[in-house]
């Protein structure tokens, strides 16, 4: 309904978002040195974290190294930081990919094994591949509710895309409820054709697209959005180049008067909702 | 001032106990680890074992097992438990603070004496 007399003025948006959903989590744990799982229930203030502008994340796999505090550690084993004298370590030397400052002393780390003594949170993060399958791999039964309110100032009109009556224990669909503001975050996947479990390992970035076509004339008024979806992470991205979406947090706490704190490497899902479209009027 | 003073030592048998203790004053005692050293007659100071602020533990090969190095960052305090005592066991024991991110001691204690001789 493109009409060349119309006066077209692109949408000023905002954006809230809920998500919800519970996540039972096997975790591996090591008692009096015997390998064991437990399990753990996981809420939303568990898996979301905030984030500014229209972005929320969900968590879909994690690494954790518990019980570190500041002191002196052998570095984690790799080709850059293993040594056989102290000549192998530079006192003071901070190396951009290291996790500490080198003391200068090459110790053992395990059996014979020997790695430069840095100051760090120690133990050091040990570098290992994230869990196959994801722990949070029940995140695809998700749900999240976008909550869009739109307007076009020069037309003074406003809207949202949830109206009065919507029944909100709807979930998107394309063609079936094409107007439902709750999407399953599996759903999003599949209408990209990618598979939730296999981007939940290592992380993504999904763009939810709010479409506003809106014309704004008496007689043809119509102004609802139009939902769509796109991977914008690289999916063939090889290894070197970091693949996925992750960062690190920590939990700190205080144990024996000493501050101490859990590091967890993140990898997850960054949804970006992407609002754009425009109101014609004459 | 700072101040480290150990106490417990004194006469046992093999294969008896012995509990040492060190009491820190005048150091922020969360901030340092502590340490047990002993020197045998004629001999050179050597670590027995080794406790970081958080409780991060390390013993040399001989006490393995055998003795254990605790603290208590609330009371300013270490201990070393000692087990199945040996007579090679017998030596002065110091009690050392080092700064968490030092690698020598900064300050060490007197010294008590421990005899394991039947």
């Known amino acids: 309904s493109d009409k060349l007399y119309q006066r077209k003025e692109p949408v000023i948006s905002s954006v809230h978002t809920k998500v919800k959903g519970i996540a039972e989590v096997k975790e591996e744990i090591v008692e009096n040195g015997v390998k064991k799982l437990v399990h753990s229930v996981f809420d939303t203030a568990d898996y979301t974290f905030p984030l500014q502008g229209n972005s929320f994340f969900v968590m879909t796999n994690f690494l954790k190294t518990e019980g570190q505090e500041q002191r002196l550690c052998p570095e984690y084993p790799t080709r850059r930081t293993l040594c056989s004298s102290d000549r192998g370590c530079k006192k003071g030397w901070m190396d951009p990919q290291s996790k500490g400052i080198q003391t200068g002393r090459c110790v053992v780390y395990e059996g014979n094994q020997k790695t430069c003594e840095v100051s760090a949170w120690c133990p050091i993060e040990a570098v290992e591949e994230a869990p196959r399958p994801a722990l949070l791999n029940s995140a695809e039964n998700f749900t999240v509710l976008i909550k869009n309110n739109i307007d076009f100032p020069g037309h003074n009109y406003t809207t949202r895309n949830i109206l009065p009556g919507l029944n909100i224990t709807c979930t998107f669909h394309k063609t079936q409820n094409p107007q439902c503001p709750i999407f399953r975050l599996g759903d999003i996947f599949r209408e990209t054709g990618d598979n939730f479990s296999d981007v939940a390992i290592q992380g993504g970035i999904m763009g939810i697209e709010i479409y506003w076509d809106c014309n704004l004339d008496r007689w043809f008024h119509h102004c609802r959005p139009k939902y769509s979806f796109r991977r914008l992470d690289d999916k063939t991205t090889n290894v070197s180049l970091y693949p996925g979406y992750n960062f690190r947090y920590a939990k700190y706490y205080k144990e024996n008067n000493v501050e101490k704190r859990t590091l967890i490497k993140v990898f997850g899902i960054r949804f970006d909702i992407l609002v754009f479209g425009t109101g014609g009027k004459f | 001032e700072v101040q480290l003073v150990e106490s417990g030592g004194g006469l046992v048998q093999p294969g008896g106990s012995l509990t040492l203790s060190c009491a820190a004053s005048?150091?922020?005692?969360?901030?340092?680890?502590m340490s047990w050293h002993r020197q045998a007659p004629g001999k050179q100071r050597t670590l027995v074992a080794d406790i970081s602020p958080g409780g991060h533990t390390e013993y040399e090969d001989s006490v393995k097992g055998r003795f254990t190095i605790s603290r208590d960052n609330f009371k300013n305090t270490m201990t070393l438990h000692m087990n199945s005592l040996k007579p090679e066991d017998t030596a002065v024991y110091f009690c050392?603070?080092?700064?968490?991110?030092?690698?020598?001691?900064?300050?060490w204690g007197q010294g008590t004496q421990v005899t394991v001789s039947s």
């Open positions: 005048g150091i922020a005692f969360n901030y340092y680890s």
């Open positions: 050392a603070a080092r700064l968490r991110f030092e690698v020598s001691s900064n300050y």
